[in-house]
């Protein structure tokens, strides 16, 4: 009963989050205009990973997509496959634990598959959740970092009294949806895992039984046979995600510079 | 066709409040920012602020902020702005004007209403 | 607030004539998310209501004539009319459209010569 629980809630946890995961990629809302330095703004900017857009205070909203692939900054670019990835593994993931769910009965389908589905869409949950994670990290991080290069230089000619403020980006609300809803499909995929264990079969300890023949002292000791689960050693060690953390020496200016290449 | 017809001439002491109406007619009225604009005579032109009927969301020019209230009435498709604690510097024509929707400018005016403070 | 200043104040010139103003910002118009100018450009005669010509700097509101053009970026812009008619004499105000208060220009004068 706990298993089928733990399976359930496991699945419901990661639906939430690949549906957030989705939500986040779609959203325009990557990187909003910080008003802090200019909160009378008539004009307000937001960009998403598809595109860039500008909200007039009459209304008026105008979306332009980045029509390009190989003029957008190569960390945009790798944030896009991240969450692409994440998606994709995430989908898959949901695919395999809706027929590995114990409460769907398919055919004469064991529990050893059930279990060895389980444990699948559970790892495919936590690495579409890492991606998701580190997806949305990168661009926080790159936002960071462009955030204090445009303040280095705000006012960009002060002669003549004239001022340029240069726009700068802050976290929008898409980057808040994907950490948390990274976060739920990875705590989702552990508990996929968790629920595997609970649904392998038991082993089977046969006690050993000495059988004293007539004639001679010779006990038989049936060896304890072992369910093969198809999910023992051979998956203990295995290495399931390398973050392998990256420095990025050169910082990229994103967006404004390559929005209409 | 588009039109805003706003209320008659006033007469005002100072320290009394009027209160303007601007009756909007041939489009969407909630769909629209109304700003109000004045110009007192011979001079340029000073921005008021602007209301969005449909969300009552308003933005004030901080040098009105404290006298001028702007209120609409959707049954009536009706902006209204009210100045308080009168002057005679705010002896002017006052404009309301539809927020264009492709852009932050105003495209439709009223006609205009003369607010004359004399004592 | 933004400060628009506009030069010549006023401006004398004859029908035919290719005029020009311009007006100056306190601070860029330039909106780098979508690389606009939020600039804005009225016509007014005397008892009338102010008439928008030019949004986004340099774009023609629908059905204002052709010889009516708005150019220029940042912080200097430019309101021509290539050829004058008798029509065009009245005053001619910029707009701050970027941030709030909303401000407007002096204005410059066009009167027949």
């Known amino acids: 009963m706990a298993v089928t629980a733990c399976q359930g809630l496991g699945f419901v946890v990661s639906l939430i989050g690949i549906a957030g995961i989705i939500a986040a990629t779609c959203m325009d809302q990557w990187s909003t205009q910080d008003l802090y330095n200019n909160p009378v703004t008539a004009v307000f900017n937001y960009q998403g990973l598809w595109r860039s857009c500008v909200r007039e205070s009459s209304g008026f909203t105008e979306c332009r997509g980045y029509f390009t692939l190989l003029g957008l900054p190569a960390m945009l670019q790798a944030v896009r496959a991240l969450m692409i990835v994440g998606i994709v593994l995430g989908a898959i993931g949901l695919l395999v634990s809706i027929f590995a769910l114990k409460c769907i009965r398919i055919g004469s389908m064991e529990d050893s598959a059930k279990a060895n589905m389980t444990l699948t869409s559970g790892i495919m949950f936590i690495v579409s959740g890492l991606c998701a994670i580190a997806g949305v990290s990168v661009f926080a991080n790159m936002l960071v970092t462009n955030f204090w290069m445009s303040t280095a230089n705000m006012y960009t000619g002060m002669g003549g009294m004239v001022q340029t403020v240069q726009t700068r980006y802050t976290f929008g609300a898409a980057l808040f949806v994907g950490w948390v809803a990274g976060g739920l499909t990875l705590i989702g995929g552990v508990m996929m895992c968790i629920a595997c264990r609970g649904l392998a079969p038991e082993e089977t300890n046969y006690k050993a039984v000495s059988y004293h023949a007539s004639g001679h002292s010779v006990a038989y000791k049936p060896g304890g046979f072992k369910a093969s689960t198809g999910f023992g050693s051979n998956t203990k060690n295995k290495k399931i995600y390398d973050g392998g953390a990256r420095t990025e020496d050169e910082v990229q200016s994103y967006p404004s510079k390559h929005d209409y290449v | 066709q588009v039109q805003l017809v706003q209320s008659g001439a006033e007469v005002k002491k100072p320290g009394a409040s009027v209160k303007l109406s601007c009756k909007a007619s041939?489009?969407?009225?909630?769909?629209?920012?109304m700003h109000w604009v004045r110009q007192a005579p011979g001079q340029g032109l000073e921005w008021i602020g602007m209301?969005?009927?449909?969300?009552?969301?308003?933005n004030y020019n901080e040098k009105f902020k404290s006298r001028a209230t702007l209120t609409v009435d959707t049954s009536t498709s009706t902006a209204y702005m009210e100045l308080s604690s009168l002057r005679s510097e705010d002896t002017a024509v006052y404009y309301c004007?539809?927020?264009?929707?492709?852009?932050?400018?105003?495209?439709?005016w009223g006609q205009g209403t003369t607010v004359t403070v004399s004592s | 607030d933004i400060q628009m200043t506009q030069s010549p104040s006023s401006l004398s010139a004859s029908v035919g004539d290719r005029v020009t103003m311009t007006c100056k910002s306190s601070?860029?118009?330039?909106?780098?998310?979508?690389?606009?100018?939020?600039l804005t450009w009225y016509q007014q005669k005397p008892g009338k209501a102010p008439k928008l010509l030019i949004y986004?700097?340099?774009t023609r509101e629908s059905g204002v004539p052709s010889r009516f053009s708005g150019s220029g970026s940042g912080t200097d812009f430019t309101l021509t009319i290539s050829s004058l008619q008798p029509e065009d004499f009245a005053t001619y105000y910029c707009?701050?459209?970027?941030?709030?208060?909303?401000?407007f220009g002096g204005g410059t004068k066009l009167e027949i010569k």
């Open positions: 707009q701050n459209d970027y941030s709030y208060p909303f401000t």
């Open positions: 601070q860029s118009l330039l909106n780098s998310g979508n690389q606009k100018n939020y």
């Open positions: 041939g489009y969407t009225f909630t769909s629209y920012w």
């Open positions: 986004w700097a340099s």
């Open positions: 209301i969005h009927p449909n969300s009552g969301s308003t």
């Open positions: 004007a539809r927020r264009y929707y492709g852009s932050i400018s105003p495209d439709y």
